[in-house]
């Protein structure tokens, strides 16, 4: 099995979507919460996050392939207040698992534009076959 987290962003007109995606097997979802933090270098948790999403096992999804669950945080109009360092994280206290995505930044420029930097590939957690699956 394998659980991993990615961070991405998409732009729709003036809106900026910050997206945290957790890739997991169907049976691994239960007990996980995905959350997005801003300017929380050491204490990113659901309690201190901008938004959180509790994953549920979807009984309608068949098969044992990898599926994804997404948390989306939408900024309707980026302002200087949105400048800062962001991080996607996921946690299951039930299993003691913590995933921390790469830090990425929003920088609001003097010209009224903004840039998003630091988005990288998945940070993942591998499970060997003899450990079974999470439930």
């Amino acid at each position: 099995g394998c659980i991993n987290i990615t961070s991405s962003a998409s732009q729709e007109g003036t809106r900026l979507n910050l997206i945290c995606t957790v890739w997991h097997k169907k049976e691994e979802a239960e007990g996980f919460v995905v959350f997005l933090c801003k300017d929380r270098s050491g204490d990113c948790s659901p309690e201190t996050s901008l938004k959180q999403l509790r994953l549920k096992r979807d009984p309608g999804i068949d098969g044992v392939g990898e599926i994804s669950s997404q948390l989306m945080f939408t900024i309707s109009q980026v302002t200087p207040l949105h400048s800062g360092t962001y991080q996607c994280c996921a946690r299951s206290q039930k299993s003691g698992i913590r995933l921390q995505g790469h830090f990425f930044s929003i920088l609001f420029t003097e010209t009224g534009n903004y840039t998003v930097t630091g988005l990288k590939q998945r940070q993942h957690l591998e499970f060997s076959h003899n450990e079974g699956t999470l439930s």
């Epitope: 039930k94 299993s95 003691g96 698992i97 913590r98 591998e126 499970f127 450990e131």
Partner: antibody, heavy 112, light 106 residues
Framework: QVQLKESGPGLVQPSETLSLTCTVS????????INWFRQPPGKGLEWMGT???????DYNSALKSRLTISRDTSKSQVFLKMNSLQTEDTAIYFC??????WGQGASVTVSS | DIQLTQSPSLLSASVGDRVTLSCKGS??????LAWYQQKLGEAPKLLIY???SLQTGIPSRFSGSGSGTDYTLTISSLQPEDFATYFC????????FGAGTKLEIK
Amino acid sequence: QVQLKESGPGLVQPSETLSLTCTVSGFSLTNYGINWFRQPPGKGLEWMGTIWNDGGTDYNSALKSRLTISRDTSKSQVFLKMNSLQTEDTAIYFCARGMEAWGQGASVTVSS
Amino acid sequence: DIQLTQSPSLLSASVGDRVTLSCKGSQNINNYLAWYQQKLGEAPKLLIYNTNSLQTGIPSRFSGSGSGTDYTLTISSLQPEDFATYFCLQHNSGYTFGAGTKLEIK
């Protein structure tokens, strides 16, 4: 098969340091985190601290100043060290994989 | 810190009875509530997590419900092996246990 086993001294002198080891099998400590809990005789349960799969730690604020949790992933062992023990620290100490699979517990008596 | 109050502290019941145990938080737990069963001299066993998710291998006669600060564990038809002490645990902010409900044979 997931298994956890606590080991350590059954008797500790007041003011001394308690050292406990949790040895796990059937899973990797880099994939799952370990909690330490304790239960005084005839009483309820108390969470002490967590070492996550990534090695980060969280502690119960009431115990934080005298508690350290660490691990040796190559030996599949997690360690609890708590200093300045008093008689009220007498308890059964449990390690658990997250919240789900628990060891049988190690009895610790603090007495002179 | 979140405090949990369990009631009753002692419950007498018979095999086949439907019983309900209560757990009340001092503040919102956001459904991050688990239930454990503990028998004398044994480690606690996880029954329910996230309010109503049944742990693998636990019989379906156990169920959980609730929201906000108020939560319940229901055993639909008591079996002889169910007589034990039950603890609730909040995992919304750290971990805090209730004092327990002892379920004894009437």
